[in-house]
């Protein structure tokens, strides 16, 4: 760092809002593809390269010339198994946060053309290219339709497909957003013998509506309408299919065989939550109730004598919760062992830790194969060897993020094999594997600057750096940035951590005005070793406040006991952690107690708002963005895993006592900015316009801004300058900054 | 490796029923359709009808009154089987897998001769 | 039920030099159309499918175009393997439909 530890003699520049605005300093990726155990695809100047991992040369794989002629912006592209085609992707259209409708072409990588015959249509929602060869699976008009090579004609699998009525092969809103995080609800077996696919129907599901203004020049603005099921209304219901693709004949009917949900889950309302193929013949399906503290885990097997798949009752595996719900979002996937008779998961163990546990398909009960309180985040990789696990049990920091191999043959010889390469600039590490997992490439971002390296699993020795972002840090070496705090503060004798991101030159004598970044919702973190430029990055850097979050009752990875904490109970524990997290911070001495704010989006401007509705005397100000203001507003799926249902006999009362509008008095001791993009299919504009409309009611003055057309992410660029901006002013006002 | 191996042809007698066997190996005949088509002495190709993966069955409209297509998977066999036989069904049958729109494998073909 | 008329009923063709067979369908098949060779005393194999697609280990010599009502086998240069009859069939409607054959000679 050039700079003296004296502020005033510190002659560089700061990093300004215009700075996060324009996005001047930019961190660079090294986005990879593995298209084999030992080649990955990188694209670089518009050319796309293949890179040997072992020796790391490269040669052109696709010149950017070749698609000069070709007439439409490709927005992406996606390269057959076999390497034989490559699909690309233009006329983009958003959806929602996964979903969007696109054009396809193929080009034939072996012949240099386009094929022009057979052409996938426009408007198509979903493609997915078999995991070998070149066959193709798409959706269009909510049907399912099968190329067995790209120059043929489809094979149309399904027939009862109709706009937002039945899905076939994609999710519905709710499936989507909260289930799959994916559009597509499709899973090819691992050869492409079969297609397995889930239908979603919303015949029943009641409507969301919302104005679009669009242009100027629409005299009447158009009406949005999305099956949307809030919390206790109903839900969409679904059936599972598998077609074997080897049997498709355009003169005849495709036949999908259903596999039924076992009967646990048929006595009600369930969801079908995770897809995954063991083998060829060999598929897992998880189940959860609409209660979602009982999930079940089918295994069925393919009979070629009949062409029906099976279920044995002996090989569900049961996975419930007593003290919340099952899995941090949804109930974890399988990783299946190569003959498909046994697997592992993450599982929550008696401590309550998330740990991996081994199964075999045929006993009920499981061995965990790690151990701590710690907890493992994600499985990586399974070979016949070795399983690769990220997990934060390094230096018993949860905000950390670490490699680890396990021997499977003896599981008490584990190895972290990110822990000690970097360890002052890398404490947060994610992986992406070769194709069997024998090259990897290590992402670091943070605490330093993002370091992207590969590594040979033969020795996990280091191959070479990738990316090591050393022409931004030498541009933000005239920067003067801020620092962040990684730290935790003892509550009930029980560790809560936060982070500050400090201004420069923070010297602890003097006060500074604190911005607490709160979002706080179930299974969150925010408190982590990731190195971020953000608007907290300006605040710190140019406006010399200190920018803190704190994950308190509620957040994620450390274990249920934290975690279930709010089960039931949202607006309670996670909320007033906030208020006592603020009060620690102001007697650390350095935070001016008078100039304290609390910012917060979706679910932290739920936070945000119960907080500065509580009547607290610490908060002075806060701005809530797209924010949750009643449960009953929200999707049945996300707030009833943690509210249950909105019923007398459940949790009615707590539904109507944890109400933003029910603290509209309190709202006259501070000043308040409310936000909300007009529309926002995920927190829908009603929730905001009932928070106005109970301020206007008992009188508060307070300050508020809509977003025409925006939705959950106020991310047009014209609009994601003028919140930042605008809120930029906010919190100057508030906290008398010039 | 896949096959079809054909028998049960021969000589018939007007008015008699015909069952023919296709028997596959190297592939489920649960997965794949089976077709039959005919062919005369010195003639073309022509079609009679098909069971499909699921069991389903679609004919020709000249064959339908008096053919059955059947199968047994647990055999991988499948069956022709036509009744009320007059000389000009005197043809080689063949068996053929069908390959979504086209037959990638043919059974050897079998004769079968309908005369008095 | 859809037609299909083959031309020439027979050709021949001297070794080497380029055989052509046209295939026309009553009404439009798009592109649903198949070719099999049929040698002596043997069951027919397939050689190209969906009008222009190669089967496995058929030599590039053949070769198929066509769409709509259209189709024409070529075999760019004949060889004495090559004697047979060539049927086209069309996959496009049940009942499922062949060409009455062309019978490929040596000259």
């Known amino acids: 760092n050039k700079g003296t530890d004296d502020a005033t003699a510190d002659s560089r520049k700061t990093y300004t809002l215009t700075d996060y605005l324009k996005n001047t300093y930019r961190l660079k990726l090294y986005s990879l593809r593995w298209i084999s155990d030992h080649e990955y695809l990188y694209k670089q100047e518009n050319n796309i390269l293949v890179f040997n991992a072992e020796y790391g040369n490269s040669s052109v794989f696709l010149e950017n010339s070749t698609f000069d002629e070709f007439g439409h912006s490709i927005n992406d592209y996606s390269i057959s198994p076999d390497g034989q085609f490559i699909l690309l992707e233009y006329n983009y259209v958003k959806q929602w946060r996964h979903s969007y409708t696109a054009s396809y072409d193929i080009y034939d990588l072996n012949k240099r053309q386009l094929i022009t015959e057979e052409r996938i249509p426009n408007n198509t929602q979903w493609v997915t290219w078999s995991p070998v060869g070149h066959k193709l699976a798409y959706v269009w008009n909510n049907d399912i339709y099968v190329k067995i090579e790209p120059n043929l004609p489809s094979y149309r699998i399904t027939w009862t497909g109709k706009e937002d009525i039945i899905y076939n092969g994609i999710t519905d809103w709710v499936y989507e957003e909260e289930v799959f995080s994916a559009y597509s609800a499709l899973w090819w077996s691992p050869n492409g013998t079969f297609l397995a696919y889930a239908q979603f129907n919303d015949t029943e599901v009641p409507l969301i509506e919302y104005s679009f203004y669009s242009d100027e020049s629409l005299q009447y603005p158009k009406t949005v309408r999305v099956p949307y099921p809030k919390a206790g209304a109903v839900n969409p219901t679904v059936k599972f299919f598998v077609v074997n693709t080897d049997s498709l004949s355009s003169v005849t009917n495709a036949t999908s065989i259903q596999i039924t949900a076992p009967a646990s889950m048929l006595i009600g309302d369930h969801y079908l939550c995770d897809v995954t193929w063991a083998t060829q013949e060999r598929i897992s399906l998880q189940w959860l109730r609409r209660i979602q503290n009982y999930s079940v885990m089918d295994i069925c097997d393919y009979d070629e004598s009949s062409g029906r798949w099976n279920c044995l009752v002996a090989r569900q595996h049961i996975e419930m919760s007593t003290t919340g719900w099952v899995g941090r979002f949804r109930p974890s996937e399988p990783h299946f062992t190569l003959d498909g008779n046994s697997f592992y998961k993450i599982i929550s163990n008696e401590e309550g830790y998330r740990h991996i546990c081994y199964f075999q398909i045929d006993k009920k009960d499981c061995t965990f194969i790690t151990k701590g309180t710690w907890e493992v985040i994600g499985i990586e990789a399974l070979t016949s060897d070795y399983l690769y696990y990220i997990s934060n049990e390094y230096k018993g920091m949860p905000g950390g993020r670490n490699l680890y191999k396990i021997q499977l043959s003896d599981y008490t010889k584990v190895t972290c094999l990110s822990c000690e390469l970097n360890p002052e600039r890398c404490q947060y590490y994610s992986v992406s594997f070769s194709k069997e997992a024998k090259y990897y490439q290590l992402r670091c971002s943070g605490p330093g600057l993002p370091l992207y390296t590969l590594h040979s699993s033969v020795n996990d020795k280091g191959l070479r750096v990738l990316e090591d972002n050393s022409a931004l840090d030498k541009m933000l070496q005239n920067v003067q940035m801020p620092s962040k705090k990684l730290d935790f503060i003892i509550l009930n004798e029980t560790k809560f951590w936060y982070q500050m991101i400090l201004p420069p030159h923070f010297d602890k004598s003097k006060k500074y005005p604190l911005l607490l970044d709160v979002y706080a919702g179930p299974c969150s973190q925010k408190a982590d070793t990731v190195f971020r430029l953000n608007w907290a990055t300006y605040l710190a850097s140019t406006e010399n406040i200190i920018v803190a979050s704190f994950d308190g009752r509620g957040s994620g990875y450390q274990g249920d006991k934290i975690m279930h904490a709010i089960n039931r109970r949202l607006g309670t524990f996670e909320v007033e952690d906030q208020i006592e997290a603020a009060r620690q911070f102001s007697k650390m001495g350095f935070v001016d107690n008078k100039r304290i704010a609390i910012w917060g989006w979706s679910y932290g401007g739920y936070v945000t708002s119960m907080v500065l509705g509580s009547g607290s005397g610490v908060f002075k100000c806060g701005i809530a963005v797209a924010p949750v203001s009643r449960w009953e507003y929200y999707d049945s799926v996300y707030t009833e895993r943690y509210m249950g249902l909105p019923t007398p006999e459940d949790n009615l009362d707590h539904y109507r006592n944890s109400t933003v509008m029910s603290r509209a008095e309190n709202f006259k001791q501070v000043e308040y900015l409310l936000i909300h993009g007009t529309a926002d299919d995920n927190v829908h504009f009603q929730q905001s316009a009932q928070i106005s409309k109970a301020l206007v009611d008992v009188g508060v003055d307070f300050q508020a801004m809509w977003y025409t057309d925006e939705d959950h992410g106020i991310a047009s660029s014209t609009a994601h300058q003028h919140i930042y901006t605008h809120m930029s002013h906010f919190i100057k006002q508030c906290f008398s900054l010039p | 490796e896949v096959q079809l191996v054909q028998s049960g042809g021969g000589v018939k007698q007007p008015g008699e029923t015909l069952r023919l066997t296709c028997t596959a190996s190297?592939?489920?005949?649960?997965?794949?359709?089976v077709h039959w088509v005919r062919q005369a002495p010195g003639k073309g190709l022509e079609w009679v009808g098909v069971?499909?993966?699921?069991?389903?069955?679609d004919y020709d409209a000249a064959f339908m009154s008096r053919v059955t297509i059947s199968k047994d998977t647990s055999k991988s066999t499948a069956y022709l089987q036509m009744n009320s036989l007059r000389a000009e069904d005197t043809a080689v049958y063949y068996c053929?897998?069908?390959?979504?729109?086209?037959?990638?494998?043919w059974g050897q073909g079998t004769t079968v001769t309908v005369s008095s | 039920e859809i037609e299909m008329t083959q031309s020439p009923s027979s050709l021949s063709v001297s070794a080497g030099e380029r055989a052509t067979i046209s295939c026309s369908a009553s009404?439009?098949?798009?592109?649903?159309l198949n070719w099999y060779q049929q040698k002596p005393g043997q069951a027919p194999r397939l050689l190209i499918y969906?009008?222009?697609n190669l089967h496995t280990g058929v030599p590039a010599r053949f070769s198929g175009s066509g769409s709509g009502t259209d189709f024409t086998l070529t075999i760019s240069r004949l060889e004495p393997e090559d004697v047979a009859i060539y049927y086209c069939?069309?996959?496009?409607?049940?009942?499922?439909?062949f060409g009455s054959g062309t019978k490929v000679e040596i000259k």
């Open positions: 053929m897998r069908n390959r979504h729109d086209w037959f990638d494998y």
């Open positions: 190297g592939f489920s005949l649960t997965t794949y359709g």
């Open positions: 069971i499909w993966g699921d069991g389903r069955t």
């Open positions: 009404q439009d098949i798009r592109n649903s």
């Open positions: 969906y009008s222009s």
């Open positions: 069939q069309q996959s496009n409607k049940l009942p499922l439909t």
